[in-house]
Interface confidence: low
């Protein structure tokens, strides 16, 4: 009753904060400056309220802190006098999702700020091309994602729905494989994975080039170009050339845009052009032998895109070799 002359109660405000799994976040809360500051951060679930962090009488009070928050929370102590009651929250887990309430009391008022913390995860997905016996498959895979993403496939820019989805992780984060059987198809395919909470999208695009027929000891040029629609100029990416043989992939060349370094794993392999413009990653394979027949895969990948280009090379015996036999 004594306090009522000085004390006003301000209703609750609400804010949404989106964090990423394993990263740190600040849950914001501000108040009008006053003396005798008391701060209580609490987490509310369907059944209970848990103490996250408390401050009163000029220092942090962690005696009643719930163990799940031990060594993971702190306030900006030097800024409390300026009206900053924000909570610094380390190493987010999906279990941290939910409603956080910040109660701030001063000599003249009390406020309650409500922060809804949503935690998302989106580890860079991959697009893989696999051959199993006589069948060919495209797999869009995301190792860790939350909440469930939207996965869409397109064939020649037309949406298609017939894909086989596998998901692990019942509560999240989820690991998701979406597989498409592309046996015998010459179409181009695109897979998009979107996490709408984090507003993050990844796209994988697969293109099969026309088969190349070459003679023994000739050279072959394998095209692979970066499409500007997909990659922004300052985006880091990597280029991997590999060969598919009996379902196993062996790397032939590797390029990193950040360092502009190329590593060749096959001496007969070289770039078609100098990589000055960093957009044409076509390759030359010289001195062809019969055993060079097969599928060659160019993979250009960034955090947001994967472009896969497949070439089928058929090497035939040269006339001299044929007449020798």
């Amino acid at each position: 009753i004594f306090l009522s002359a000085f004390f006003t109660y301000v209703p609750m405000n609400e804010q949404i904060i989106i964090g990423r799994l394993g990263e740190d976040i600040i849950l914001p809360s501000s108040f009008e400056r006053g003396s005798e500051v008391v701060i209580h951060w609490k987490y509310q679930d369907s059944y209970n309220s848990y103490n996250v962090h408390s401050y009163y009488k000029g220092s942090g009070r962690l005696e009643s802190q719930d163990t799940r928050y031990a060594n993971r929370t702190s306030l900006f102590y030097n800024e409390i006098q300026n009206g900053n009651a924000s909570l610094f929250f380390r190493r987010l887990s999906l279990l941290d999702e939910g409603i956080y309430t910040c109660y701030v009391g001063t000599a003249i008022q009390a406020i309650t700020n409500k922060v809804v913390l949503k935690v998302g995860v989106f580890l860079t997905p991959m697009m893989k091309y696999e051959k199993r016996n006589t069948n060919s498959f495209l797999i869009c895979n995301v190792l860790s994602v939350y909440p469930r993403p939207i996965i869409t496939w397109k064939m020649d820019n037309t949406p298609i729905s017939e894909n086989n989805m596998q998901e692990t992780g019942s509560l999240g984060p989820f690991s998701i494989n979406s597989t498409l059987n592309i046996t015998g198809s010459n179409s181009s395919y695109e897979c998009t994975i979107e996490n709408s909470l984090l507003k993050q999208t990844w796209t994988g695009r697969w293109t099969m080039k026309d088969g190349l027929h070459k003679m023994q000891s000739e050279h072959v040029s394998l095209s692979c170009e970066l499409v500007n629609d997909y990659f922004s100029p300052n985006q880091d990416f990597k280029v991997t050339w590999s060969r598919m043989e009996s379902g196993i992939s062996s790397i032939l060349a590797y390029y990193l845009s950040s360092s502009q370094n190329t590593t060749f794993y096959e001496s007969r392999f070289s770039w078609n052009k100098e990589l000055k413009n960093q957009s044409d990653f076509s390759m030359n394979l010289t001195d062809l032998s019969l055993s060079d027949s097969g599928e060659y895969l160019c993979n250009i990948s960034s955090d947001e895109y994967t472009l896969l280009t497949i070439h089928t090379v058929h090497v035939e015996p040269s006339q001299e070799t044929a007449s020798d036999n």
Epitope: E14, I16, G98, I99, V116, K118, P147, I150, S196, K199
Partner: antibody, heavy 120, light 107 residues
Framework: QVQLVESGGGVVQPGRSLRLSCAAS????????MHWVRQAPGKGLEWVAV????????NYADSVKGRFTISRDNSKNTLDLQMNSLRAEDTAVYFC?????????????WGQGTLVTVSS | DIQMTQSPSTLSASVGDRVTITCRAS??????LAWYQQKPGKAPKLLIY???SLESGVPSRFSGSGSGTEFTLTISSLQPDDFASYYC?????????FGGGTKVEIK
């Protein structure tokens, strides 16, 4: 197919209350954010409120904050809008709309709307 | 809150015309913009999302472009069925907002 059916509209006096409902079917209701959007006669669209898929968060347009309350019952596939202290400027067709996904996005599906008239 | 300014508010055009509607955001919204078509007495219909992606079933004469703060909706060849009102909507922030609308009427 997805269906959203609003009900509860009508004529009400200024200062009184009204409760709108939206019955959803044809999709997993608990996976999607739900919104109320209104349109005054002859005017444009105005977003009113959202409730997240799991009910943990509600956001309101400044024009209705403190007067309107959005709620949902995921077991019954229903969305409600409790409107208190109604004003003449709240007169509009109220649409319920389904978010594209679980977070704030665009609206793929809309109800047919229910008319609320605030008049003395 | 992010404000969306649409122009023009009314547009008179003929069948076969190329029509462009502009939407400007008060701050950058990346590509988080949708376009809707609405006919009198009906609910809005989604045309474009993520600034330029065409919603399934929407005719290809509709296209969207832009990012950041400037966006456009283009109808390449206006058809009789296209006379309607059009709205942009941002969903970059967690309070969505619509533009004021553009009414496309017969000249």
């Amino acid at each position: 197919q997805v269906q959203l059916v609003e009900s509860g509209g009508g004529v009400v006096q200024p200062g009184r209350s009204l409760r709108l409902s939206c019955a959803a079917s044809g999709f997993t209701f608990s996976n999607y954010g739900m919104h109320w959007v209104r349109q005054a006669p002859g005017k444009g669209l105005e977003w009113v409120a959202v409730i997240w898929y799991d009910g943990t968060n509600k956001n309101y347009a400044d024009s209705v904050k403190g007067r309107f309350t959005i709620s949902r019952d995921n077991s019954k596939n229903t969305l409600d809008l409790q409107m208190n202290s109604l004003r003449a400027e709240d007169t509009a067709v109220y649409f319920c709309a389904r978010d594209r996904n679980t977070a704030m996005d665009y609206f793929v599906y809309w109800g047919q709307g229910t008319l609320v008239t605030v008049s003395s | 809150d992010i404000q969306m300014t649409q122009s023009p508010s009314t547009l008179s055009a003929s069948v076969g015309d190329r029509v462009t509607i502009t939407c400007r955001a008060s701050q950058s919204i990346s590509s988080w913009l949708a376009w809707y078509q609405q006919k009198p007495g009906k609910a809005p219909k989604l045309l474009i999302y993520k600034a330029s992606s065409l919603e399934s079933g929407v005719p290809s004469r509709f296209s969207g472009s832009g990012s950041g703060t400037e966006f456009t909706l283009t109808i390449s060849s206006l058809q009789p069925d296209d006379f309607a009102s059009y709205y942009c909507q941002q969903y970059n922030s967690y309070s969505v907002t619509f533009g004021g609308g553009t009414k496309v009427e017969i000249k």
